[in-house]
Interface confidence: low
Amino acid sequence: TQNKALPENVKYGIVLDAGSSHTSLYIYKWPAEKENDTGVVHQVEECRVKGPGISKFVQKVNEIGIYLTDCMERAREVIPRSQHQETPVYLGATAGMRLLRMESEELADRVLDVVERSLSNYPFDFQGARIITGQEEGAYGWITINYLLGKFSQKTRWFSIVPYETNNQETFGALDLGGASTQVTFVPQNQTIESPDNALQFRLYGKDYNVYTHSFLCYGKDQALWQKLAKDIQVASNEILRDPCFHPGYKKVVNVSDLYKTPCTKRFEMTLPFQQFEIQGIGNYQQCHQSILELFNTSYCPYSQCAFNGIFLPPLQGDFGAFSAFYFVMKFLNLTSEKVSQEKVTEMMKKFCAQPWEEIKTSYAGVKEKYLSEYCFSGTYILSLLLQGYHFTADSWEHIHFIGKIQGSDAGWTLGYMLNLTNMIPAEQPLSTPLSHSTYV
C-alpha cells in the first residue's frame, strides 16, 4: 500500500553508506520551506542491507542488484510516490572500497558501475555512487554530529532536549570507527595544523571553522584484527596461534590466503610453511592490549606531536562524540554510560576477555558467533586506539561521549554528506528569508 502525499510541504533524501562490512540506507526528511535552518533535517528510516559490503561483490557483481533491492523497496514504501522523482539518492563508499581500489582500480570501478546501474532503475533522482575520501568521511561525520547537536545554530531554542547539554557553541570533535578505517576530527584550540593534508576550512552559518581531520586506513576494527593476526603469526612457532584477544576455549581456523588478501596485511606478509592456522583463545586483556600497541608505530614523528605512524595530531580539545563501531561495541559491552571511568572500562574488559567462550556463548545466545567472538578484541582495540593512539587520558576520557543517535538520527557521515550535496548548509547565517544558494561547503 503506497503512502498518500503528505499535506505539509516536505522533502526527502536517501544516502547509502557502503561500508566495508555492510551497507546501510538512510532516509532523511525536512520541511521544504526551512531548508537553510539548522537542525531541521531528521532521519526517518534506516535499512541495513543483508549481506557483506559491496567490495565483497567483486567476483559476483551480477548479485549487487538484488542485494540492494530490499532496502530500495523499503525506501519506495516510506517515501510518498508523489515525492519519488524529486528525492535525491547518493551512495558513498568508504574504506572497504578504498582498499579494493588500491588493489585494482578496474575492479573497484566495475563494482561502482553495477551499483550505479542498479540504483538508476529506481524511480528516485539518483545522483551517483562514489568512493568518498577519508578526509570527507571525517569532515561529514563532524558536520553531522554538530548539526544534530545544534552547534551551528545561533538560536538555542532546543538545547534543553539535546542529550549532551553543554549550552555553548563549542563544537564536538568526531571519532568514527568503521571496519576498515577510523577517523578523528575536531577544532584544535589556537593550534596551527602543521600538516596541510589534515586541515579543513569551513564557513558555516556565518562562522569560520579550522578543522583537523585524519582517516587511518587499515585501522578500522576488522582490518586492525587482520593486521594483528598477520603480525602475530609471523612469530608463531607452528600453525597454532594462541591469541589473548579471544576468549579461553575459542577456536577458529584461518586460511593464510584470506589473511593476506587485504592490502592492510602486506607489511607483515611472509611465506609460511602452512596454508591454514588455528586461533586458540587465551583471553588475556593485558597481553591483547600489548599486541595491539605493536600496530601503532610511535617511534617516528616529524611534527610537534603525532598520533601514530608519523601522523600529526594536535592536542585534544573539548568534547568528542564517538560513534559507529565505537558506539556499537561499547554498547554491547554496556560501557557507554558517562559515569563509567576509563579505569572501570579497563577493569570490565579484563573480566570480559577472561570469560570462557562456552560461557560467553550461553550468556549471549542469539548473537552471531562471528561478531560475539570479536568483542574482546574490539573493546581492547578501542581502548588502545583512544588512549595510546589518540592520547586520551583517564581524565579526558570523560569528554568522550559514546553516541548512537542524536535526536533520532544516527551519528555518522551520511547526514553531513547529504546536507552538503543538497546545499543545505549555507556559508552565511540565513536571514528570515533564505539567502540565494551561492557559497556552500
Epitope: 538484488i66 530490499d70 546501474r117 552471531k368
Partner: antibody
Framework: QVQLVQSGAEVKKPGASVKVSCKVS????????MHWVRQAPGKGLEWMGR????????KYAEKFKNRVTMTSDTSTNTVYMELSSLRSEDTAVYYC????????????WGQGTMVTVSS | DIVLTQSPALAVSPGQRATITCRTN??????????MNWYQQKPGQPPKLLIY???SLASGVPARFSGSGSGTDFTLTINPVEANDTANYYC????????FGGGTKVEIK
C-alpha cells in the same frame, strides 16, 4: 554448523490455531530472512511467507495473508509461524528455511513439522 | 505473482541424461541476474538445494547436476542419472519473494 530444529507434530481440530517454532543454532536469525514452506501429503511445496527478524518485517503469500502470523524472538534465536482457522486442507508438513540475501543459496531447512487437522 | 510450470513426470534409465523443464511467467531475470533455483526432495526429507541463480552449483552437490536458461525458460539436467536420483525436483524463483513449480517426479527405470 547451522541447524534448524522445529517443534513436534501437532493434531488440531478444524477452526483451531497452531503455532510451530523453529529454533536456529550456530548463527543468529538476524543474519537471515526466515521463510515458511508447507507440503500437503503427496503434493508440492507451497511458500507461505517470510520474516526478517532484524526488523520484524513480514511478507505473506496472498493465500495466507489473513490467517498466518510470523514472529521472531532474537533472545532465543527462534522464529514462529501461527496459522489460524485451520481446515482439513491445512494438513501438511510445515518447513522453516533460511535465506541470507535474496537470490543467494537458501542455506538451511528445518526437519519439518507435521500438522494434522481432523475432527 | 510469478507462476512456475514444470513438466510433471519423467522416467529415465541409469547412465542416461534426464532433462527437467520449468517455465516462468513473467521473467525471473532482474538487473542481469536470474533468480531461479532447483531443489531435490526425497520422501520424508526436507528439500535440498541443487542449483541457485539458474546455473550455480550448490556446495556439496555432484557435478552431474547442472542448470541452464534465462528469462522464462529453464532446464535442470542430470547426466548421467544414477539410481539414487529418484526423487521429486522443484524449480523455485526468488526474484520476487518465493514461488515453487508443481514438481517433477523422476523415476529411474
Amino acid at each position: 554448523q547451522v541447524q534448524l530444529v522445529q517443534s513436534g507434530a501437532e493434531v488440531k481440530k478444524p477452526g483451531a490455531s497452531v503455532k510451530v517454532s523453529c529454533k536456529v543454532s550456530g548463527d543468529s536469525i538476524t543474519a537471515y530472512f526466515m521463510h515458511w514452506v508447507r507440503q500437503a501429503p503427496g503434493k508440492g511445496l507451497e511458500w507461505m511467507g517470510r520474516i526478517d527478524p532484524d526488523h520484524e518485517r513480514t511478507k505473506y503469500a496472498e493465500k495466507f495473508k489473513n490467517r498466518v502470523t510470523m514472529t521472531s524472538d532474537t533472545s532465543t534465536n527462534t522464529v514462529y509461524m501461527e496459522l489460524s482457522s485451520l481446515r482439513s486442507e491445512d494438513t501438511a508438513v510445515y518447513y522453516c528455511a533460511t535465506e541470507r540475501v535474496p537470490g543467494f543459496e537458501t542455506d538451511y531447512w528445518g526437519q519439518g513439522t507435521m500438522v494434522t487437522v481432523s475432527s | 505473482d510469478i507462476v512456475l510450470t514444470q513438466s510433471p513426470a519423467l522416467a529415465v534409465s541409469p547412465g542416461q541424461r534426464a532433462t527437467i523443464t520449468c517455465r516462468t511467467n513473467p521473467t525471473v531475470d532482474h538487473y542481469g541476474t536470474t533468480y531461479m533455483n532447483w531443489y531435490q526432495q526425497k520422501p520424508g526429507q526436507p528439500p535440498k538445494l541443487l542449483i541457485y541463480l539458474a546455473s550455480s552449483l550448490a556446495s556439496g552437490v555432484p557435478a552431474r547436476f547442472s542448470g541452464s536458461g534465462s528469462g522464462t525458460d529453464f532446464t535442470l539436467t542430470i547426466n548421467p542419472v544414477e539410481a539414487n536420483d529418484t526423487a521429486n525436483y522443484y524449480c523455485q524463483q526468488s526474484r520476487n519473494l518465493w514461488t515453487f513449480g508443481g514438481g517433477t517426479k523422476v523415476e529411474i527405470k
